[in-house]
């Protein structure tokens, strides 16, 4: 019951997190005009990953897309890439985790398969969350760097007289949404990984039994394939639970109940 709850909660938390990552990626307010130097501005600027916007004194907001790809800063491209990778991984993770949910029965899917899928989705959520956090953090770092550079340049110029106050940008709402969403996705992923441990049936402790056949003694030892991926068992004729690594040419056909701890 606790396992199902952990898995379900992990799924819900990840779902909220990924929705947040998508929202953050689409939001226009990644950076907003810093009003400290000009609190009375009638023209408010803010920028997103895809377009920049200006809200004018009439209340009208004009947004213009970045219609160039090559002209954009490499850092912005990197942030876009990280966010998209995060969304894609998160979406795939959600798809996998739906089938992995213990409360949903799909044919005769065994617990080991569900455990395996839960682990896979958990890892995907963790990577997705990390991508989002990394993307937002890179953008935030870029903002901080630019902020202090523009502050340094603000009062320099011909004879110290500057007519144009350089617009500085500070953290927008999307950054906070992204950080929280990334964190939630990460937490959800960890919860899925924890649930995976409980989903796999307890390891059966077989007693060593010796079979005497043709003068050969083959011992069936307890515990097996602790490090395996669980998508199949050894179909060759050497049925020895040796707990070791398998060779690459071994065919994997059906999941083993004892592939997970």
């Amino acid at each position: 019951m606790a396992v199902t709850a952990c898995q379900g909660l992990g799924f819900v938390v990840s779902l909220i997190g990924i929705a947040g990552i998508i929202a953050a990626t689409c939001m226009d307010q990644w950076s907003t005009q810093d009003l400290y130097n000009n609190p009375v501005t009638a023209v408010f600027n803010y920028q997103g990953l895809w377009r920049s916007c200006v809200r004018e004194s009439s209340g009208f907001t004009e947004c213009r897309g970045y219609f160039t790809l090559l002209g954009l800063p490499a850092m912005l491209q990197a942030v876009r890439a990280l966010m998209i990778v995060g969304i894609v991984l998160g979406a795939i993770g959600l798809l996998v985790s739906i089938f992995a949910l213990k409360c949903i029965r799909i044919g005769s899917m065994e617990d080991s398969a569900k455990a395996n899928m839960t682990l896979t989705s958990g890892i995907m959520f963790i990577v997705s969350g990390l991508c989002a956090i990394a993307g937002v953090s890179v953008f935030a770092n870029m903002l901080v760097t630019n902020f202090w550079m523009s502050t340094a340049n603000m009062y320099t110029g011909m004879g110290g007289m500057v007519q144009t106050v350089q617009t500085r940008y500070t953290f927008g709402a999307a950054l906070f949404v992204g950080w929280v969403a990334g964190g939630l996705t990460l937490i959800g992923g960890v919860m899925m990984c924890i649930a995976c441990r409980g989903l796999a049936p307890e390891e059966t402790n077989y007693k060593a039994v010796s079979y005497h056949a043709s003068g050969h003694s083959v011992a069936y030892k307890p515990g097996g394939f602790k490090a395996s991926t669980g998508f199949g068992s050894n179909t060759k004729n050497k049925k020895i639970y040796d707990g070791g690594a398998r060779t690459e040419d071994e065919v994997q056909s059906y999941p083993s109940k004892h592939d997970y701890v």
């Epitope: 920049s52 009439s58 007519q163 106050v165 617009t167």
Partner: antibody, heavy 115, light 113 residues
Framework: QVQLVQSGAEVKKPGASVKVSCKAS????????VHWVKQAPGQGLEWIGY????????KYNEKFKGKATLTRDTSTSTVYMELSSLRSEDTAVYYC????????WGQGTLVTVSS | DIVMTQSPDSLAVSLGERATISCKSS????????????LTWYQQKPGQAPKLLIY???TRESGVPDRFSGSGSGTDFTLTISSLQAEDVAVYYC?????????FGGGTKVEIK
């Protein structure tokens, strides 16, 4: 078509208050701020402040704080400006204006303060 | 507050001649976000409400005759009427649309010589 229709002229005694209305039509009322401008007889234009009909947020020119109060009624797409403690120098034509770059102005409301 | 200074106060021009009005702001009206100058020009005829002529310092409002043109950037702006017509007799105002409080120039009265 877009229209901003203001209430009629008012004559008030010093110390009294007056409420001028501005009814908007022909556009989505909550999409644009409604600003108010004062024009004293034979004088130039002076910005009073604005109201955001979407969330009731207001901003005033420091000179008019305590003098003008802006409110709105979204059900009737109407903005109101109340001028309190009227004095002779408040005698002016008051305009409401809206849309991008204030493309549309009301016809103006003459408020006369006279004893 | 941004101070808008218009000159001259009044201007008498012959029909068909060019009229030029100057407007200076005490601070730059250039918005770095979109590289637009937030300066607006209005025309006010006697007994009427002001009418929008030009926004962003040089963009003509739809329906405004092309004899009206705006130019300038930063702090110095100009409104030009290339060939004055009788219906252009009015007071012209420039307005800071960049910073609160929004401020207007004192106005320039254009008359026919």
């Amino acid at each position: 078509q877009v229209q901003l229709v203001q209430s009629g002229a008012e004559v008030k005694k010093p110390g009294a208050s007056v409420k001028v209305s501005c009814k908007a039509s022909g556009y989505t009322f909550t999409n644009y701020f409604v600003h108010w401008v004062k024009q004293a007889p034979g004088q130039g234009l002076e910005w009073i402040g604005y109201i955001n009909p979407y969330n009731d947020d207001t901003k005033y020119n420091e000179k008019f704080k305590g003098k003008a109060t802006l409110t709105r009624d979204t059900s009737t797409s109407t903005v109101y400006m109340e001028l309190s403690s009227l004095r002779s120098e408040d005698t002016a034509v008051y305009y409401c204006l809206s849309l991008r770059f204030f493309a549309y102005w009301g016809q103006g409301t003459l408020v006369t303060v006279s004893s | 507050d941004i101070v808008m200074t218009q000159s001259p106060d009044s201007l008498a021009v012959s029909l068909g001649e060019r009229a030029t009005i100057s407007c200076k702001s005490s601070q730059s009206l250039l918005n770095s976000g979109n590289q637009k100058n937030y300066l607006t020009w209005y025309q006010q005829k006697p007994g009427q409400a002001p009418k929008l002529l030009i926004y962003w310092a040089s963009t003509r409002e739809s329906g405004v005759p092309d004899r009206f043109s705006g130019s300038g950037s930063g702090t110095d702006f100009t409104l030009t009427i290339s060939s004055l017509q009788a219906e252009d007799v009015a007071v012209y105002y420039c307005q800071n649309d960049y910073s609160y409080p929004l401020t207007f120039g004192g106005g320039t009265k254009v008359e026919i010589k």
